[in-house]
Amino acid sequence: DSEEDEEHTIITDTELPPLKLMHSFCAFKADDGPCKAIMKRFFFNIFTRQCEEFIYGGCEGNQNRFESLEECKKMCTRDNANRIIKTTLQQEKPDFCFLEEDPGICRGYITRYFYNNQTKQCERFKYGGCLGNMNNFETLEECKNICEDGPNGFQVDNYGTQLNAVNNSLTPQSTKVPSLFEFHGPSWCLTPADRGLCRANENRFYYNSVIGKCRPFKYSGCGGNENNFTSKQECLRACKKGFIQRISKGGLIKTKRKRKKQRVKIAYEEIFVKNM
């Protein structure tokens, strides 16, 4: 497979703080698309953490493509004043930790976690699937790492942010060095088809990880899980062809293990929830 051939070994070198993405598409590779036009566009490079120029072919591609440098910066970089990244060990909680839990105006029965400022703990709540606010985490661990105090009142913040799969809010995603190199693609591709709790009968596709194929199922209209696609093509793109989207150009990131350079392979998952 040519995807495999493109996989590069990356020498780690310069130290960078954990990458915090404003939108998941900012992590996509620059994609010139199949057409042959020569159009100057800009994309966000997750290695250099800068917006850079590339040549776009004029069709298809992905959302990591901007008409101007300014637009790219606006969508994919944060000015220093708004950064969640802290340079000191004693870190403040991000403002969104103090928002009350908000299920949102939809009703999808999704288990999420929020930081309860009264109890000073992360707690479970039922999220509806749209809107709401940023105090909304997919796992208890993510919530704790972002919003709960660590030992001695220190804030633990080894986490980056990625776009929440359901409501355009920034949801913390671990970028601790060990896990950075252990992504295995969208986890929802491994989940069974889930009809959900409502009464509609919508034609959908899910990825059957046992047989490695996309299969149709009837969706009830709410609830369920992320293994749910409106077309077979979208299902295959997310779960089969793009199960792990390999990075095809070298980048320099430092790991701190044993104080020596290490040869590592980086893979990151391409997230199709925000086409996102």
């Epitope: 009703r107 799969a165 919508e202 749910n228 409106t230």
Partner: antibody, heavy 123, light 112 residues
Framework: QVQLQQSGPGLVKPSQTLSLTCAIS??????????WSWIRQSPGRGLEWLGI?????????RYAVSVKSRITINPDTSKNQFSLQLNSVTPEDTAVYYC?????????????WGQGTLVTVSS | DIVMTQSPLSLPVTPGEPASISCRSS???????????LNWYLQKPGQSPQLLIY???NRASGVPDRFSGSGSGTDFTLKISRVEAEDVGVYYC?????????FGQGTKVEIK
Amino acid sequence: QVQLQQSGPGLVKPSQTLSLTCAISGDSVSSDSAAWSWIRQSPGRGLEWLGIIYKRSKWYNRYAVSVKSRITINPDTSKNQFSLQLNSVTPEDTAVYYCARWDSDKHWGFDYWGQGTLVTVSS
Amino acid sequence: DIVMTQSPLSLPVTPGEPASISCRSSQSLVISRGNTYLNWYLQKPGQSPQLLIYKGSNRASGVPDRFSGSGSGTDFTLKISRVEAEDVGVYYCQQYDSYPLTFGQGTKVEIK
């Protein structure tokens, strides 16, 4: 069949408070499968969402930033209705005001609308 | 705020012919569980808006199958396979990806 019946004055003086009510039949304002919103329409602005309330484990509201300092949307569970209050109005607030139900279960959209109330702000 | 931009603003149509309305969002809209966070409404003359297409591509109850919604990312389309006289009015797209909920400026469909 859900019905939304709007009531309230059609003429409001500048700097005064615009008050409208939306009476619900066929559903409950406290339903956890709906949310209740006010939207206005004017030639200059088109359809403009103003705010929404919804009951889950407790009451929540969200308002458009453009009117946040002036708007209140309240439920009245005893009368099964909800209201809009917009303070310190100016001629810019002249519009047709609609109440609408957001279907939280199936549609995830405004599936029922009131008949609309033309509110003119003028002295 | 996410700005929704529709085109054309006016669409003269011939009954029996197809029609297409475009809606572009200033930011990519969420696709989750196969749903796009975008709805389409039709406001017939002298009436309140009515829900036409929800979650990007699903027809609301009572909506004829000549109406279809499609698109993802920032580009969305409402298609009428064969326009009928009763389809005249103003069509609006609306996003619920993030607050504030925003509508397109509307496309007025009228019979030629």
